[in-house]
């Protein structure tokens, strides 16, 4: 018997206080399948309908989350907030349910939603003004001639508060990219009641026109390319409609600010990308070697000439031919399209290199992840400790700490009878989470499992987001288990960047019951197994001070491979003393971020290394011990013969050779291991 939990609709930000009540209507989500009928907008038709409202909200330009915010920005210790107006997408013409912006659109920040169309399509925008003053919806692509021909009144370029207006136009060939250009071309839409004031107040969004048969019918976007629109501008709050109100909010009486004071003016100017300053724009997350298209926009006066640079990467522009570039000069009112194949995993910066702009915070970070870096984060191994796993409640002894994949015993999982339950994992630091493996459990003759669930996540434990991923609806509902023992691997594509992961059962059998593993990597995608277990590191690359041989067994260095099975399935030195070492030659400089160690067990004897040192060398002759906090780091190794233990290297080692020096052990020195890291990357 499958029990269903009812959920209520999701907001972009949820103030999460350990309860959830989300009501799911069928049209709110899809469960992997591409059932176009579920979508509030149907993208197969030639008319693409968008419901967009002007909505007022408070904005802090990311200052509350920036560690770099200048002291003088914050008065009396608080971060100033500014009333702004933004284009907000809704699910339908009732304008009651905002369309939740998932991971793929999170980067838009202050920008309105993407409006996408192909040549010959019709675009219909139903615009509602939910703000307190008149605004409009305007794009240079919209043709108003028909209105004139039909003898209609001249176009009113504003919509009063609480009024709705529908705009309809056909995408002409001249609006589209030429055959020599990239598949899609960027334009903008904004409000033109007073173009300058409207934009400085926040009303602008990207409008993409594409070649025919480019957009996926189910998703309404090009699924083979990941798109990011970046709007570089200096927001001047003195030019906002809400300037007076914002000044009163941020400078309480008696306020003795002088309007002409340069410091005052500078405090009301924000050198922003999509409305965020100083590396705070979220959502720029992309896969290594995946095609990325950047739409670069600038608006405003001539001071909004920007010199755009992506650290560590080149990009291409296409005008008849493709040109590789490292810098792009962006002029106001010009929307440029560039593409990139990010080849280097890690965290990089996109910035305007004009000194004043860069100094003032016109930069942000983009994260390139490697799809190869997907390892268990430690539920099964115990690397994720008991205290990191909490839940809304538990049934009897079925505690959250038991929610570990493959856990065995008569009570071997987390379980709860509560209808609105959740289980939370604190990874202690932000990680890239690529997927989740789930498993149910048995109690006597009953199969207990979660058949459907949703995922929420957070970087700080306060602001929570519901995972939407590639779903065409407002959130992704994952199919879980169908029995008590099988393992279901659900992939997060795009991956989740979070410290905290919440799993919320929506359907379950008898009780919500779970064993799980999280698959992921560190933020730099640099905790990949370098090849001990997989044998990508050859036998010849593994050497040692000595090794033990017996009549029918050789415990050679090449046996020091994590999870190796067989009779002599580890490295053992000839003698057990602290002078012995095991060495790996990577044959080129690698970035080493961790080591996983494991002991070994013969029939009755457990053998493992309890403590070890690490040294490194670039030439194989000069060796340096790994130091931390000014002293040689003694790594805590294994506590049994079978459980792998991960030790992180902080800071990471850039090295060709690595040595493990066992310092204390149980019974005998015996070692199986993996080295974690990635290729060392040249920065340019």
């Amino acid at each position: 018997e499958i029990t269903r939990t009812t959920l209520q609709s999701d907001q972009e930000e949820i103030d999460y206080d350990d309860t959830i009540s989300v009501e799911m209507k069928k049209e709110d989500f899809d469960i992997y399948d591409e059932d176009e009928n579920q979508s509030p907008r149907s993208f197969q038709k030639k008319t693409r309908h968008y419901f967009i409202a002007a909505v007022e909200r408070l904005w802090d330009y990311g200052m509350s989350s920036s560690p770099h915010v200048l002291r003088n920005r914050a008065q009396s210790g608080s971060v100033p907030q500014f009333k702004k107006v933004v284009f907000q997408e809704f699910t339908d013409g009732s304008f009651t349910q905002p369309l939740y912006r998932g991971e793929l659109n999170e980067h838009l920040g202050l920008l309105g939603p993407y409006i996408r169309a192909e040549v010959e399509d019709n675009i219909m925008v139903t615009f509602r003004n939910q703000a307190s003053r008149p605004y409009s919806f305007y794009s240079s692509l919209i043709s108003y001639e028909e209105d004139q021909r039909q003898g209609a009144e001249p176009r009113k370029n504003f919509v009063k508060p609480n009024e709705t207006k529908t705009y309809f136009w056909k995408v002409q060939h001249h609006m589209a990219p030429t055959k020599d250009e990239f598949d899609c071309k960027a334009w903008a839409y904004f409000s033109d009641v007073d173009l300058e004031k409207d934009v400085h107040s926040g009303l602008i969004g990207p409008l993409l026109v594409c070649h025919t048969n480019t957009l996926n019918p189910a998703h309404g976007r090009q699924v083979t390319v990941q798109e990011f629109a970046l709007f570089f501008t200096i927001f001047d709050e003195t030019k906002s409609w809400y300037f007076t109100e914002n000044m009163e909010r941020n400078c309480r009486a008696p306020c003795n600010i002088q309007m002409e004071d340069p410091t005052f003016k500078e405090n009301y100017r924000f050198h922003a990308i999509n409305g965020y300053i100083m590396d705070t724009l979220p959502g720029l997350v992309m896969a290594q070697d995946q095609r990325i298209r950047w739409y670069l926009l600038s608006m405003g006066s001539n001071e909004n000439i920007h010199s755009i640079h992506f650290s560590g990467h080149v990009f291409t522009v296409r005008k008849k031919e493709e040109y590789k570039m490292a810098l792009y000069n962006l002029y106001p009112g010009v929307f440029e399209t560039v593409e990139m194949l990010p080849s280097k995993a890690g965290i990089w910066r996109v910035e305007c290199l004009i000194g004043e702009h860069l100094h003032a915070g016109m930069s942000t970070l983009f994260l390139v992840y490697s799809n190869k870096c997907q390892t268990p984060l430690g539920m099964a191994s115990g690397h994720i400790r008991d205290f990191q796993i909490t839940a809304s409640g538990q049934y009897g002894q079925w505690a959250p700490k038991l929610a570990r994949l493959h856990y065995s015993g008569s009570i071997n999982a987390w379980s709860t009878k509560e209808p609105f339950s959740w289980i939370k994992v604190d990874l202690l630091a932000p990680m890239i989470i690529h997927g989740i493996k789930t498993q149910g459990a048995r109690q006597k003759f009953s199969s207990l499992y979660i058949s459907q669930f949703i995922i929420m996540y957070s970087l700080d434990g306060k602001k929570w987001q519901t995972y939407r991923g590639n779903s065409t609806g407002t959130l992704m509902v994952f199919f879980g288990n169908v029995d008590s023992s099988g393992i279901k691997h659900n992939i997060f594509n795009p991956p989740i960047i979070a410290r905290y992961i919440h799993l919320h059962p929506t359907h379950y059998s008898i009780r919500s019951t779970l064993r799980m593993e999280l698959m992921g990597c560190d933020l730099n995608s640099c905790s990949m197994p370098l090849g001990m277990e997989s044998k990508a590191i050859s036998d010849a690359q593994i050497t040692a001070s000595s090794y033990f041989t017996n009549m029918f067994a050789t415990w050679s260095p090449s046996k020091a491979r994590l999870h190796l099975q067989g009779r002599s399935n580890a490295w053992r030195p000839q003698v057990n003393n602290p002078k012995e070492w095991l060495q790996v030659d990577f044959q080129k400089t690698m970035k080493v971020t961790g080591v996983t160690t494991q002991g070994v067990k013969s029939l009755l004897t457990s053998m493992y290394v309890k403590e070890f040192l690490i040294s490194s060398s670039q030439d194989g002759h000069q060796w340096t011990l790994f130091f931390q906090n000014g002293k040689v780091k003694v790594f805590q190794g294994n506590q049994d013969s079978f459980t792998p233990v991960v030790n992180s290297l902080d800071p990471p080692l850039l090295t060709r050779y690595l040595r493990i020096h066992p310092q204390s052990w149980v019974h005998q020195i015996a070692l199986r291991m993996e080295v974690l890291g990635c290729e060392a990357q040249d920065l340019y």
Epitope: F548, T549, N550, M551, F552, Q574, L603, L604, Q668
Partner: antibody, heavy 117, light 108 residues
Framework: QVQLVQSGAEVKKPGASVKVSCKVS????????VHWVGQAPGKGLEWVGS????????IYAREFQGSVTMTADTSTDIAYMELSSLRSDDTAVYYC??????????WGQGTMVTVSS | EIALTQSPGTLSLSPGERATLSCRAS???????LAWYQQKPGQAPRLLIY???TRATGIPDRFSGSGSGTDFTLTISRLEPEDFAVYYC?????????FGQGTRLEIK
């Protein structure tokens, strides 16, 4: 738990052969080699030889070469030691033992072989 | 082939005393390959020490092993009544395995 159970005592005439068995339980025979050790009455321990059921390879002590054969039946997890051309000085208790992992950690209870005319 | 010689042949001590048993090899070898066994009448030998100094599982800490090269020692720090038995040293390894002739530890 891991156990080695040997076959019962044997009385043989000189020139005959004897086959002593050693049944392992608690693990699979191919996991470890089987060593055989003899102990004549009132005397010390003497290594006879070793057999690796995984590879079928055997190593015999010089004194026993030509008169001992070690085999195994991996389907039943039984190791065998056959002594041929028995002489009266072959009278001894024969032990099977397995290394865990190196020295002889696990021993059978011993099989008394008496060679007497 | 390496020969092992144990001394003394017989050691007579009282409970509570310290026993030191010696094992000398005809040529040097790695201490990794030296073991000590205890054998009581009518029983199979029992492993005490391997790798010259590592106690086997379940062996009381009054038993300790030391030595390298050609000279190895088994020490019983404080004799208990159940420790009176015959003790053998053994050289194991990659080829031939040899035992010493044994030291009988008897109650004085």
């Amino acid at each position: 738990q891991v156990q080695l159970v040997q076959s019962g005592a044997e009385v043989k005439k000189p020139g005959a052969s004897v086959k002593v068995s050693c049944k392992v339980s608690g693990y699979t025979l191919t996991e470890l080699p089987v060593h055989w050790v003899g102990q004549a009455p009132g005397k010390g321990l003497e290594w006879v030889g070793s057999f690796d059921p995984e590879s079928g390879e055997s190593i015999y002590a010089r004194e026993f070469q030509g008169s001992v054969t070690m085999t195994a039946d991996t389907s039943t997890d039984i190791a065998y030691m056959e002594l041929s051309s028995l002489r009266s000085d072959d009278t001894a208790v024969y032990y099977c033992a397995v290394p865990d992992p190196d020295a002889f950690d696990i021993w059978g209870q011993g099989t008394m072989v008496t060679v007497s005319s | 082939e390496i020969a092992l010689t144990q001394s003394p042949g017989t050691l007579s001590l009282s409970p509570g005393e310290r026993a030191t048993l010696s094992c000398r090899a005809s040529q040097s070898f790695s201490s990794s390959y030296l073991a000590w066994y205890q054998q009581k009448p009518g029983q199979a030998p029992r492993l005490l020490i391997y790798g010259a100094s590592t106690r086997a599982t379940g062996i009381p800490d009054r038993f300790s092993g030391s030595g390298s090269g050609t000279d190895f020692t088994l020490t019983i720090s404080r004799l208990e009544p159940e420790d009176f038995a015959v003790y053998y040293c053994q050289k194991y390894g990659t080829s031939a395995i040899t035992f010493g002739q044994g030291t009988r530890l008897e109650i004085k």
